[in-house]
C-alpha cells in the first residue's frame, strides 16, 4: 500500500475492510480484548492499537485481511506523528492560553463527561 | 474546593477564571511553552498539563489564581481517570470491533486530518 494515500481515504477504506472481514476476525470466541468504557477515543489510542495487535496475532493472515492490518498500522503511524506534534512548537504564554482555552471549550461542549 | 463539583461545571468555571487571570498569567514576556500544532486536543493532554505546570511555577500565587490551578489539577485528575478506563474492561472480539469501528468512524468525521 503506498503510504502516500491520504489518511482520510485510508480511514474510509479501513472501515470498509473491517466490515468485510468481521466474520473472520470474530472466529476466536474465547479471546478477550480490553475495550475502553467511554467514548473519548483519542485518550485511548494506545490501548486500541494494543488490542489490534492482539487481534492480528490471533487472526489467520492472507488476502485482504492483511491489507486491513497494514492500514491500521498506517493509521497508528499517523496518530503517533500527531502525538509528536503536541510539543514541537514553543510559543509565548498568550498563545498557550489561547490553545488551553480552546481545549477547555472543546472539553466543555464536545467531550462525553461522566461526573 | 470540593472535588464533588461536577466536571462539566468545573470546566466552565475554569474557562471563566482563565479569562479573569489572563493579564497576570502572561506577565512573563520571555517564557515559552510548547503549543500543540493541531486541534486533536485529546492526543496532547500530557503536553498541555506539562505546560500548565510550567506556567504555575512561573506565576505569583494567591487569591483566585490558586483556584484556577487547583481546578486545572482536578481536570487533569479527571482525564487521568478517563485514561485508566481505557483498558479496564476485557470484552469479546465482537465488542472490541464495535468500539474500533466507532473510533474509526469518529476519526473519519470529526478529527482534523492533515495529510
Amino acid at each position: 500500500i503506498p503510504t502516500e494515500i491520504p489518511t482520510s481515504a485510508l480511514v474510509k477504506e479501513t472501515l470498509a475492510l473491517l466490515s468485510t472481514h468481521r466474520t473472520l476476525l470474530i472466529a476466536n470466541e474465547t479471546l478477550r480484548i480490553p475495550v475502553p468504557v467511554h467514548k473519548n477515543h483519542q485518550l485511548c489510542t494506545e490501548e486500541i492499537f494494543q488490542g489490534i495487535g492482539t487481534l492480528e496475532s490471533q487472526t489467520v493472515q492472507g488476502g485482504t485481511v492483511e491489507r486491513l492490518f497494514k492500514n491500521l498500522s498506517l493509521i497508528k503511524k499517523y496518530i503517533d506523528g500527531q502525538k509528536k506534534k503536541c510539543g514541537e512548537e514553543r510559543r509565548r504564554v498568550n498563545q498557550f492560553l489561547d490553545y488551553l482555552q480552546e481545549f477547555l471549550g472543546v472539553m466543555n461542549t464536545e467531550w462525553i463527561i461522566e461526573s | 474546593i470540593p472535588t464533588e463539583i461536577p466536571t462539566s461545571a468545573l470546566v466552565k468555571e475554569t474557562l471563566a477564571l482563565l479569562s479573569t487571570h489572563r493579564t497576570l498569567l502572561i506577565a512573563n514576556e520571555t517564557l515559552r511553552i510548547p503549543v500543540p500544532v493541531h486541534k486533536n486536543h485529546q492526543l496532547c493532554t500530557e503536553e498541555i498539563f506539562q505546560g500548565i505546570g510550567t506556567l504555575e511555577s512561573q506565576t505569583v500565587q494567591g487569591g483566585t489564581v490558586e483556584r484556577l490551578f487547583k481546578n486545572l489539577s482536578l481536570i487533569k485528575k479527571y482525564i487521568d481517570g478517563q485514561k485508566k478506563k481505557c483498558g479496564e474492561e476485557r470484552r469479546r472480539v465482537n465488542q472490541f470491533l464495535d468500539y474500533l469501528q466507532e473510533f474509526l468512524g469518529v476519526m473519519n468525521t470529526e478529527w482534523i486530518i492533515e495529510s
Epitope: 510559543r91 498563545q95 489561547d98 | 514576556e29 520571555t30
Partner: antibody, heavy 117, light 109 residues
Framework: QVQLQESGPGLVKPSQTLSLTCTVS??????????WSWIRQHPGKGLEWIGY???????YYNPSLKSRVTISVDTSKNQFSLKLSSVTAADTAVYYC?????????WGQGTLVTVSS | SYVLTQPPSVSVAPGQTARITCGGN??????VYWYQQKPGQAPVLVVH???DRPSGIPERFSGSNSGNTATLTISRVEVGDEADYSC???????????FGGGTKLTVLG
C-alpha cells in the same frame, strides 16, 4: 513550506469596506502554533500591524484601527479574511497577510489597495 | 500603547559595520525581532529573540538588547544589504504587535 496569497479588489471607494482574503497553502490554518495576521504598509512608510486571529476565532486588533477592523477565519477553506470599514485615502497601502508564531514567519507577497473615487 | 523609535536612515560604506537602533521603554525586558525589507518585496526575519539568527541568514547579522535600546549590527556590510530594517516587539499584556518606524540602510559608493 507554508505559502500565503492575498486576494481582493485593488481599488475601493471612500466610505466603503475594504475586503481581502488570504489563502494558506502548504500547511493547515488549524495549526495551533500560529496566529494569522494582517499588516499594512503605506507608500514609503513603515509596517503597521492591523490584527491577528487564532484558529479558534480569538482576535487581537491594533487599538487605532479596532473600531473599523474585523478579521475572520474559515478553517474549511484554509483562509482568513480582513474587513476594514469606512475607508479613506489614508487607508491606501500595501496589505500583507502573514503567519505569526513568536514572530512573523511567512508572508504573502502583498497587495496594493488604493482608496479613491 | 508601546512605542518603538528607529532612526529614519543609516549610511555606511561597504565593508564597514552598520548599527541600527530601536528604542523603547525598558525594551531590554522584551524579545526583539528584526526584519529586512527590500523594495517591492515582503519583509524577511533576520534576527529573532534579540540575537538569534534564523537559518540562511549570514553570521554578519547580529543583535543585542538591554536597557532602553535594542541594536541590529551588520558587520562587513555588502551592497546587497541595502534595505529597510524594522524592529518588532510584543506589547504585554495586550499581546499587540508593535513595529518600529523602519530604518533605511544605504550602502555608500
Amino acid at each position: 513550506q507554508v505559502q500565503l496569497q492575498e486576494s481582493g479588489p485593488g481599488l475601493v471607494k471612500p466610505s466603503q469596506t475594504l475586503s481581502l482574503t488570504c489563502t494558506v497553502s502548504g500547511g493547515s490554518i488549524s495549526n495551533g502554533g500560529y496566529y494569522w495576521s494582517w499588516i499594512r504598509q503605506h507608500p514609503g512608510k513603515g509596517l503597521e500591524w492591523i490584527g491577528y486571529i487564532y484558529y479558534s476565532g480569538s482576535t487581537y486588533y491594533n487599538p487605532s484601527l479596532k473600531s473599523r477592523v474585523t478579521i475572520s477565519v474559515d478553517t474549511s477553506k484554509n483562509q482568513f479574511s480582513l474587513k476594514l470599514s469606512s475607508v479613506t485615502a489614508a487607508d491606501t497601502a500595501v496589505y500583507y497577510c502573514a503567519s505569526l508564531g513568536n514572530w512573523f514567519d511567512y508572508w504573502g507577497q502583498g497587495t496594493l489597495v488604493t482608496v479613491s473615487s | 500603547s508601546y512605542v518603538l523609535t528607529q532612526p529614519p536612515s543609516v549610511s555606511v560604506a561597504p565593508g564597514q559595520t552598520a548599527r541600527i537602533t530601536c528604542g523603547g521603554n525598558n525594551i531590554g525586558s522584551k524579545n526583539v525581532y528584526w526584519y529586512q525589507q527590500k523594495p517591492g518585496q515582503a519583509p524577511v526575519l533576520v534576527v529573532h529573540d534579540d540575537s538569534d539568527r534564523p537559518s540562511g541568514i549570514p553570521e554578519r547579522f547580529s543583535g543585542s538588547n538591554s536597557g532602553n535600546t535594542a541594536t541590529l549590527t551588520i558587520s562587513r556590510v555588502e551592497v546587497g544589504d541595502e534595505a529597510d530594517y524594522s524592529c518588532q516587539v510584543w506589547d504585554s499584556p495586550s499581546d499587540h504587535v508593535v513595529f518600529g518606524g523602519g530604518t533605511k540602510l544605504t550602502v555608500l559608493g
